[in-house]
């Protein structure tokens, strides 16, 4: 960067060289080049010179004024005209920030998305801060007292094995900058309370001809978690509005679930699954389309294979994904 | 790719315990699925025995209950299978496996033979 | 316990016949039948979970089928490498149960 080059003098911010968006600022150049009684000495902001707000303190030093700094990252730098010089010399440069301090870190939630082998915690760290920002996530064995910190940028995954003080944690988040520092409230956890089983993936569809046609959503995850607790939902791809359903889940085999549709119509679906009583929810699957076939349905496509279903004509959709992928996104 | 292999004595005493180890790599034991203990036979009947699940929990074929114990070391990546109190009975080849979810055991070990006899 | 019964200890076939292995469960598994296949010194093999879902890498000659207590599984054109004992496993709940093998045999 910028800080890199050698100077022949010194530049400085004054309140600071990271301070507060929207402060007035000034920044100071001082030359020290030999054989050199500087004519003028000029100010450059990412490359472009100033024209405004300089005044020249003695013969070796100037200052260039900033009312309300609103740019997160600049590079400055300043030069000298000296006489029988034709071009002018570089004195020195700095890169200046600005931001805010960080806000109390809140809605700390530490999750174990099953088949991990981490739990992941996250937190809404408020408004952006435009500086470098650290979080130190501070988790605590109510067991054994025994305390770790893990430093992150973000959110941070923490090895299951390294939590060896038992099951119940006391979790929070420090959030430090050049700025400021605040401290998150405390989160209590039990591991075995905020598992997220394996994702629920819908597999295929087929819409069975019968007195009164109905659909059927092929549908399975790979949890380990006997009590699961699934819903899901569907609409009309023209509607805004979804349909719910509920399920209480086994998964010791693939999932099928029955809607009766109206025929000829696009139909999008989703599920999402919670162990039994627990917090926190899968994200919802992907988009699962399936049209439904018009009253004398028409074979479109051919599952990968079934021999449940003996007789009546099936309109088949498949999905892309597999059974046993494991997709994760937000926290539901 | 994941693996799995057996080890322990070929031969036991009746009436001493049986103590057996499955190695697993290419998957950590402490990550996911329940890791199980099957044995076989000499006529081919398999029958489950029991699991560790990933959270080290353990479930047990309730006609072993009383003598079976499943323990594990994580640093290790390794699982293991106690049987107390062994008779002739208890003479078979011994599979450790991995379980698709809460379905079928996708992943077994090449299995270990093991004779009951004084 | 459930039990699982396979009726046929033997099942003799020829190359490129099809052939159906049945197994009956002593009460509803729903469709949480596993099938496996195990050549002689092997260890059992997954080809089928929940009745009638091939496992990965499973040729698409192997099929499974029913629900409740029924249950079928078919090849539809044997291969000499088929030649092995098939068991089917209930993985509706513990203890988990086998069937007790059928042998298919070449005639």
């Known amino acids: 960067g910028i800080t890199n080059i050698n100077c022949s003098g010194h530049i400085w911010v004054e309140p600071a060289t990271i301070f507060k968006m929207g402060m007035n600022i000034s920044i100071y150049c001082q030359a020290a080049i030999k054989n050199c009684q500087p004519r003028k000495l000029h100010f450059y902001k990412n490359g472009i010179k100033e024209r405004f707000q300089i005044t020249r303190i003695n013969k070796t030093t100037a200052r260039l004024w900033y009312k309300n700094f609103l740019e997160p990252h600049a590079s400055m730098y300043c030069t000298a005209e000296c006489p029988k010089h034709f071009q002018e010399t570089l004195i020195c440069g700095k890169d200046i920030s600005s931001g805010y301090p960080p806000d109390i870190p809140d809605e700390v939630t530490c999750v174990i998305y099953e088949y991990s082998g981490n739990m992941t915690c996250t937190w809404n760290a408020g408004k952006l801060t435009y500086i470098d920002t650290k979080y130190v996530v501070h988790v605590k064995s109510l067991e054994t007292e025994e305390e770790q910190q893990y430093l992150t940028s973000s959110y941070i995954n923490i090895s299951t094995d390294s939590l060896q003080g038992g099951k119940k944690y006391l979790v929070w988040v420090q959030a430090a900058n050049a700025l400021g520092m605040e401290e998150s409230k405390q989160l209590q956890i039990h591991l075995d309370d905020i598992v997220i089983p394996s994702a629920a993936v819908i597999s295929r569809a087929e819409t069975i001809n019968a007195t009164v046609p109905k659909t059927i959503i092929y549908w399975d995850s790979q949890t380990t978690i006997e009590k699961v607790s699934c819903e899901m939902r569907y609409k009309a791809t023209t509607n805004q509005t979804w349909n719910v359903k509920e399920f209480d889940t086994n998964f010791t085999y693939v999932q099928q679930s029955e809607f009766y549709l109206e025929p000829n119509i696009k139909y999008v679906f989703q599920v999402r699954c919670q162990e039994t009583g627990k917090r926190y929810w899968q994200p919802w699957s992907s988009l699962f389309f399936h049209k439904t076939p018009e009253t004398v349905p028409q074979v479109t496509s051919k599952a990968f294979q079934h021999d449940t279903w003996n007789s009546g004509l099936t309109v088949a959709s498949i999905s892309t994904g597999h059974l046993t992928s494991d997709n994760r996104g937000d926290i539901g | 790719q994941v693996q799995l292999k057996e080890s322990g004595p070929d031969l036991v005493k009746p009436s001493q315990s049986l103590s057996l180890t499955c190695t697993v790599t290419g998957y950590s034991i402490t990550s996911g699925y329940n890791w199980h203990w099957i044995r076989q036979f000499p006529g081919n009947k398999l029958e489950w025995m029991g699991y560790i699940h990933y959270s080290s929990g353990t479930i047990y074929n309730p006609s072993l209950k009383s003598r079976i114990s499943i323990t594990r070391d994580t640093s290790k990546n390794q699982f293991f299978l106690q049987l107390n109190s062994v008779t002739t009975e208890d003479t078979g080849t011994y599979y450790c496996a991995r379980q698709l979810g809460l379905k079928a055991m996708d992943y077994w070990g090449q299995g270990t033979s093991v004779t009951v006899s004084s | 316990d459930i039990v699982m019964t396979q009726s046929h200890k033997f099942m003799s076939t020829s190359v490129g016949d099809r052939v159906s292995i049945t197994c009956k469960a002593s009460?509803?598994?729903?469709?949480?039948v596993a099938w496996y296949q195990q050549k002689p010194g092997q260890s059992p093999k997954l080809l089928i979970h929940s009745a009638s879902y091939r496992y990965t890498g499973v040729p698409d000659r192997f099929t499974g089928s029913g629900s409740g207590t029924d249950f079928t599984f078919t090849i539809s054109s044997v291969q000499v490498e088929d030649l092995a004992v098939y068991y089917c496993q209930q993985h509706y709940t513990t203890p988990y149960t086998f069937g007790s093998g059928t042998k298919l045999e070449i005639k």
């Open positions: 009460q509803d598994v729903r469709t949480a």
